[in-house]
């Protein structure tokens, strides 16, 4: 499995380096998760032809995956640090059920899927420390999540492959937009 951020050989070799700031730690954590997603996407794309499908064709799905919109304050027009941070944390919490679904969906990258899931939990904790307005963050309902997970796991093989691909692609896009916004904060 990949080594978590802050534990790579470069860090060990440089013990006198300044400790990472909160922002640097978040940045590194997101890049680590993106690396994990990249590895998972490789396996998915090798297994099926989903990756060749156009975005438009894949858009016809009933998954309610979190996505950044103008109103979320994470883009340059209408940028709002607090609103954006709430959206990032809320979105990551909503992605957790989909990351749970990804477990057992990979053969050669099983540990990688677990690493992405666990690293996301750590990222959420980092971000919650940064947020001032934690009251505005809505946590998904566990019962709703449980029934969603059951529904997703009951799909046929083709739909499960499609779902896996869509989750990875959407999660990657969400993290990219999140990190770009965080780099402005």
């Amino acid at each position: 499995a990949p080594v978590p951020p802050g534990e790579d050989s470069k860090d060990v070799a440089a013990p006198h380096r300044q400790p990472l700031t909160s922002s640097e730690r978040i940045d590194k954590q997101i890049r680590y998760i993106l690396d994990g997603i990249s590895a998972l996407r490789k396996e998915t794309c090798n297994k099926s032809n989903m990756c060749e499908s156009s975005k438009e064709a894949l858009a016809e799905n009933n998954l309610n995956l979190p996505k950044m919109a103008e109103k979320d304050g994470c883009f340059q027009s209408g940028f709002n640090e607090e609103t954006c941070l709430v959206k990032i944390i809320t979105g990551l919490l909503e992605f957790e059920v989909y990351l749970e679904y990804l477990q057992n969906r990979f053969e050669s990258s099983e540990e990688q899927a677990r690493a992405v899931q666990m690293s996301t939990k750590v990222l959420i904790q980092f971000l919650q420390k940064k947020a001032k307005n934690l009251d505005a963050i809505t946590t998904p309902d566990p019962t709703t999540n449980a029934s969603l997970l059951t529904k997703l796991q009951a799909q046929n093989q083709w739909l499960q492959d499609m779902t896996t691909h869509l989750i990875l692609r959407s999660f990657k896009e969400f993290l990219q937009s999140s990190l770009r916004a965080l780099r402005q904060m």
């Epitope: 993106l34 990219q176 937009s177 990190l179 770009r180 780099r183 402005q184």
Partner: nanobody
């Protein structure tokens, strides 16, 4: 890393326009974020604009907002910087840079590949 080549620079009068291109032969260029930076003589290199892997995710420096437009054509492995209403203070060497994570940002450290630069001179 990807090899980046900038082109399109030149001499232009104040109020004029130029379109810079940043091209690569790299296979997965569409997955990279690309940023434009500039460096005027005797000054620090500064952020101009960037575009994410998702083309709708663009950011601009305050000084160029509304005058410059960044865009990408993944089929041509090229990112463009259209510069309108050019001012003498836009004179600089313009560099493009790529970020393999598809994110970008307004600091040089976020990018892992750099081009050699193209000169833009705004003068009458």
């Amino acid at each position: 890393e990807v090899q980046l080549v900038e082109s399109g620079g030149g001499l232009v009068q104040p109020g004029g326009s130029l379109k810079l291109s940043c091209t690569t032969s790299g296979r997965r260029f569409s997955e990279y974020a690309v940023g434009w930076f500039r460096q005027a003589p005797g000054k620090e290199r500064e952020f101009v604009a960037d575009i994410g892997e998702q083309a709708e995710n663009t950011w601009y420096a305050e000084s160029v907002l509304g005058r410059f437009t960044i865009s990408r054509d993944n089929a041509k492995n090229t990112v463009y910087l259209e510069m309108d209403g050019l001012k003498p203070e836009d004179t600089a060497v313009y560099y493009c840079a790529a970020d393999k994570y598809g994110v970008g940002g307004n600091a040089q450290g976020y990018y892992d590949s750099w081009g050699q630069g193209t000169q833009v001179t705004v003068s009458s």
